[in-house]
């Protein structure tokens, strides 16, 4: 009785179960009653990452430097190349097909999380007691200067964009 279902890592063809090709290899010919499935290793710059019956291997991804990409992990016969972005840039998608410049946090905002090759800068508004007076992809919100610890007094209040201005205390005559 010909099978209607096959075991794991097999496929049904011409009423018989044939072995799938292992990752890193492509199908050359289906099995017969006399021979096993014939598979061949993928060529240079090609891969197949699953047990398969593909007749062609996939091309490794090209990390195009014109798009700000570079190789993070070189592909093998069983894995695709992984691209990431050049320093200062991050991927526009999970597939990392292109890059954009890291966002800078405007004055009044500080860096909550520094950008990586795959994620953009995360900014946060500087809370009371903190400020940022620069546009930066690295600077966090800085705490206002503590005038008291310097034996000074606040002459000008701080904002989310400016530090406090300290000055000498008025002397009693």
């Amino acid at each position: 009785e010909p099978p209607t279902a096959c075991r794991e890592k097999q496929y049904l063809i011409n009423s018989q179960c044939c072995s799938l090709c292992q990752p890193g290899q492509k199908l050359v010919s289906d099995c017969t009653e006399f021979t096993e499935t014939e598979c061949l290793p993928c060529g240079e710059s090609e891969f197949l990452d699953t047990w398969n019956r593909e007749t062609h291997c996939h091309q490794h991804k090209y990390c195009d430097p014109n798009l700000g990409l570079r190789v993070q992990q070189k592909g093998t016969s069983e894995t695709d190349t992984i691209c990431t972005c050049e320093e200062g840039w991050h991927c526009t998608s999970e597939a990392c097909e292109s890059c954009v410049l890291h966002r800078s946090c405007s004055p009044g905002f500080g860096v909550k999380q520094i950008a990586t090759g795959v994620s953009d800068t995360i900014c946060e508004p500087c809370p009371v007691g903190f400020f940022s007076n620069v546009s930066s992809a690295f600077e966090k919100c800085h705490p206002w200067t503590s005038c008291e610890t310097k034996d000074l007094v606040v002459q000008q209040a701080g904002t989310n964009k400016t530090d406090v201005v300290c000055g000498p205390q008025d002397r009693l005559r």
Partner: antibody, heavy 117, light 107 residues
């Protein structure tokens, strides 16, 4: 009990033809692929031809392609090998074999073909 | 075509000894290899399939190993009836090919 019985061998002149038969019994013939394998006197084994269980697909090595034809009659439980343009190097014992689990799991007793003038 | 090379051509041993027969493929054939035994005047019979799978009715002293290009048939302790010729056969791709055989003879 699985049995494969070859017949049709004998002495034949170069250039002539011969048809070998293999009568199968003890199993469901139509469920199995079948092959012919030969062995020249004092030599090793050489695959000659294979045919799928339904008879739709046939396979040959290059050295016999075009000269040999494998066929089967599932209603008669019989396998055939038609050999044409015979040569001295075709002299051998011809075995009929059954394909089970992609192996030649049963063999007949063989029939001797001698090509000689 | 995949070429199978068996070695040695002849193995001279005494009953009770261990026999190790080699079969080397010209390219990787995974585990797609069978072993056959042929006694003088008899037809071959299947001993081992898929390189290491045992066949019912074949004594446990026969075992196979290997994968890729190098395969071994081992007879753990030779019995008088084991003196014969042994052939390997690949079924990885067409054409089906056999090794030239190893003769195990009594020393």
């Amino acid at each position: 009990e699985v049995q494969l019985v070859e017949s049709g061998g004998g002495v034949v002149q170069p250039g002539r033809s011969l048809r070998l038969s293999c009568a199968a019994s003890g199993f469901t013939f139509s469920n199995y692929g079948m092959s012919w394998v030969r062995q020249a006197p004092g030599k090793g084994l050489e695959w000659v031809a294979s045919i799928s269980s339904g008879g739709d697909d046939t396979y040959y090595p290059d050295n016999v392609k075009g000269r040999c034809t494998i066929s089967r009659d599932n209603s008669k439980n019989t396998l055939y090998l038609q050999m044409n343009s015979l040569r001295a190097e075709d002299t051998a014992v011809y075995y009929c074999t059954r394909a089970g689990g992609k192996a030649m799991d049963y063999w007949g007793q063989g029939t001797l073909v001698t090509v000689s003038s | 075509e995949i070429v199978l090379t068996q070695s040695p051509a002849t193995l001279s041993l005494s009953p009770g000894e261990r026999a190790t027969l080699s079969c080397r493929a010209s390219q990787s054939i995974r585990d797609n290899l069978h072993w056959y035994q042929q006694k003088p005047g008899q037809s071959p019979r299947l001993l081992i399939y898929y390189a290491s799978q045992s066949i019912s009715g074949i004594p446990a002293r026969f075992s196979g190993s290997g994968s890729g290009t190098d395969f071994t048939l081992t007879i753990s302790s030779l019995e008088p009836e084991d003196f014969a010729v042994y052939f390997c056969q690949q079924f990885n791709s067409w054409p089906l090919t056999f090794g030239q055989g190893t003769k195990v003879e009594i020393k």
